[in-house]
């Protein structure tokens, strides 16, 4: 009966050697792909000279296989019923799933110029930077290959800076041969309702990026949730990509390869301004760009990116306020394509299918002292790329799931 199923589930979702959950948790059996769309700037000169709207054209997908490496340094702590680990990063380009090669060129914002002018607002330092920018023949925009843009290149302007500074720049630099964590999560041995919930990240229960409760590390890493998920639940999870905890709410029942799953989505409320959703007040960290915290749909994560002016949003500024996208032409937000969802099998709490979508933007501001930014008359939150990270349970795994879990219940 149900009691037997519950007992089996409780045993098998514990994160310890020998359980079904543990085997799949150490190294996911699902193939995960990360698709990138790059925003190619069509009118760099007009923007730089006349402060025109930036015209972008998305190009993609460029697809990489990710999260194929097993968790490392897995250590059980029987004292507090936790297991700690590192999640290694790796990306392998998939030409057959891409529209071009890693050598394709794109016109994008000059990351170093935009970041340096933000990190060093002092006018004297900016005058110095300006002379180096001019000397290196750098400009507001640059042409870079996909490989350079994503994984890193040596910047000619930063190479001239006469004091210690990292000269390598890239949207995801460094990535390969790095790891996310250390994560310490509850293994569920003492209480199955805590399984996979993060206890600490990098040795702390807080992030030190936000004020108040916004700084908390809540929930799991979204790969799984404690079992017996209810539709009424708000599922909390932490995403290191966006340097914050966030949540998903039930949207609909979905049949995934014969398995009944619950589709949970990130609601627009999660991206709202504090005016619309007071709970978000502590995610507003500055008053000027956010127009006194009335803008919505973009998250300033500069504190998490060594001061670089990185803003996270949904693709094409979905769920963002009009003022955010009014300086950009060529965006077409679409809920179906650009929102994030998780398909969760409710009995086990396993995420059997997901689509994580996010956009990485960089703020660029006028600078009286930096020639290539001098003619700008307004701030721009410039979209650089958006990504769609997806994973779906394989046919074999789905068959096993149907027979061992859902089949037994039905």
């Amino acid at each position: 009966g149900d009691m037997l199923i519950q007992k089996t589930i409780k045993k098998e979702v514990v994160l310890e050697e020998g359980t079904i959950a543990f085997k799949n948790w150490v190294k996911t059996g699902t193939e995960i792909y990360r698709q990138f769309w790059i925003f190619d700037v069509q009118n760099p000169q007009e923007v730089m000279m006349n402060s025109s709207n930036i015209q972008v054209k998305q190009r993609g997908p460029y697809t990489y296989r990710v999260r194929f490496l097993a968790k490392e340094n897995i250590t059980q702590d029987p004292k507090d019923n936790t297991v700690s680990f590192l999640q290694p990063n790796g990306a392998i380009f998939e030409p057959s799933l891409s529209v071009g090669t890693e050598a394709d060129n794109f016109t994008v914002l000059n990351l170093a110029v935009a970041a340096a002018s933000h990190i060093y607002p002092n006018p004297f330092v900016q005058v110095v930077l300006n002379s180096l920018i001019n000397k290196s023949k750098s400009s507001m925009f640059q042409v870079r290959t996909l490989r350079e843009l994503l994984w890193g290149y040596t910047d000619p302007f930063l190479s001239l800076v006469p004091y210690p500074v990292s000269t390598r720049v890239g949207m995801f630099y460094p990535y390969n041969n790095t790891a996310d964590g250390v994560y310490k999560v509850f293994n569920g041995k003492d209480s199955i309702s805590k399984v996979a919930i993060i206890d600490t990240y990098k040795g702390k229960r807080n992030l030190s990026y936000w004020e108040s409760y916004c700084d908390m590390i809540n929930g799991t890493d979204a790969a799984s949730f404690p079992p017996f998920v209810e539709k009424s639940q708000v599922l909390q999870f932490f995403s290191s990509d966006i340097c914050r905890s966030i949540y998903a709410v039930f949207e609909s029942d979905v049949n995934l390869k014969g398995i009944p799953v619950y589709r949970f989505v990130l609601p627009s409320k999660a991206f709202a301004s504090p005016v619309q959703n007071p709970d978000n007040h502590c995610f507003c960290t500055e008053k000027i760009i956010s127009k006194n915290c009335t803008s919505y749909g973009v998250l300033d994560i500069s504190k998490c990116k060594e001061g670089k002016p990185v803003y996270i949003s949904l693709p094409h500024f979905l769920y963002a306020s009009p003022d955010v996208s009014e300086t950009i032409d060529g965006l077409n937000p679409n809920e179906e394509e650009h929102r994030t969802y998780l398909d969760i099998e409710p009995i086990t709490g396993f995420t059997l299918q997901f689509a994580k979508r996010l956009q990485v933007n960089l703020l660029v501001k006028p600078s009286n002292k930096i020639q290539v930014l001098k003619r700008l008359k307004r701030n721009y939150i410039v979209p650089i790329l958006w990504l769609n990270e997806t994973g779906t349970i394989g046919d074999e795994k789905a068959k096993m799931f149907r027979s061992q879990v859902t089949g037994k219940i039905n």
Epitope: Y120, N122, P123, V125, V127, S131
Partner: antibody
């Protein structure tokens, strides 16, 4: 209030070196650049270079590269300028100055000046 | 390097008269011009900073105008305490460069 206290007058022999100091008072040393200016009756005011203790950024007027070396000691909130291989051309009043910050005010605060006389 | 040409080199004016000093730059510097007053035995004092901005505590008889390459500094009603040397400084690009100075005396 903001003050820039410079070292006293120096009489030095040709070919020798001299190190001038500038102690910053009344503000956070690492937040603002310190720049050095030379004044002579013949050439008037000339900008030598500047140092931003917070970012370790140093920049020189090409004309004074090799002549002046700028350093800063955060622990004592003091900036230094060393002048080497001195000749009579280097006889001048040297000022250290601080900007007004983010409001476009350059050389808003000045030291009293250090008179350097190069003579055999 | 941006050169700054200041004129006149000296100026003898009566009390109450209007004083005009001009600086011309060899490159376009927007409005990144600053003006200083130096009295004998003292360091220069910033009167007007970039964007023709009068510094706090500086009397309103001092003003400046200009954009690009041509800049004018004005004392509306000269007082005896205004006797000094006056310098302009371009702060648009490196190296920063000063004008050669204008000596203002009483007629």
């Amino acid at each position: 209030q903001v003050q820039m206290k410079e070292s006293g007058a120096e009489l030095v022999r040709p070919g020798a070196s001299v190190k001038l100091s500038c102690k910053a008072l009344g503000y956070t040393f690492t937040d603002y650049e310190i720049q050095w200016v030379k004044q002579t009756p013949v050439h008037g005011l000339e900008w030598i270079g500047g140092i931003h203790p917070g970012s370790s950024g140093i920049v020189y007027n090409q004309k004074f590269k090799g002549k002046a070396t700028l350093t800063a000691d955060k622990s004592s909130s003091t900036a230094y300028m060393e002048l080497s291989s001195l000749t009579s051309e280097d006889s001048a009043v040297y000022y250290c100055t601080r900007g007004g910050g983010y409001d476009g005010a350059w050389f808003a605060y000045w030291g009293q000046g250090s008179l350097v006389t190069v003579s055999a | 390097e941006t050169t700054v040409t200041q004129s006149p080199a000296s100026l003898s004016m009566a009390i109450g008269e209007k004083v005009t000093i001009r600086c011309i730059t060899s490159t376009d510097i927007d409005d990144d011009m600053n003006w200083y007053q130096q009295k004998p035995g003292e360091p220069p004092k910033l009167l007007i900073s970039e964007g023709n901005t009068l510094r706090p505590g500086v009397p309103s008889r001092f003003s400046s105008s200009g954009y690009g390459t041509d800049f004018v500094f004005t004392i509306e009603n000269m007082l005896s305490e205004d006797v000094a040397d006056y310098y302009c400084l371009q702060s648009d690009n490196l190296p920063f460069t000063f004008g050669s100075g204008t000596k203002l005396e009483i007629k």
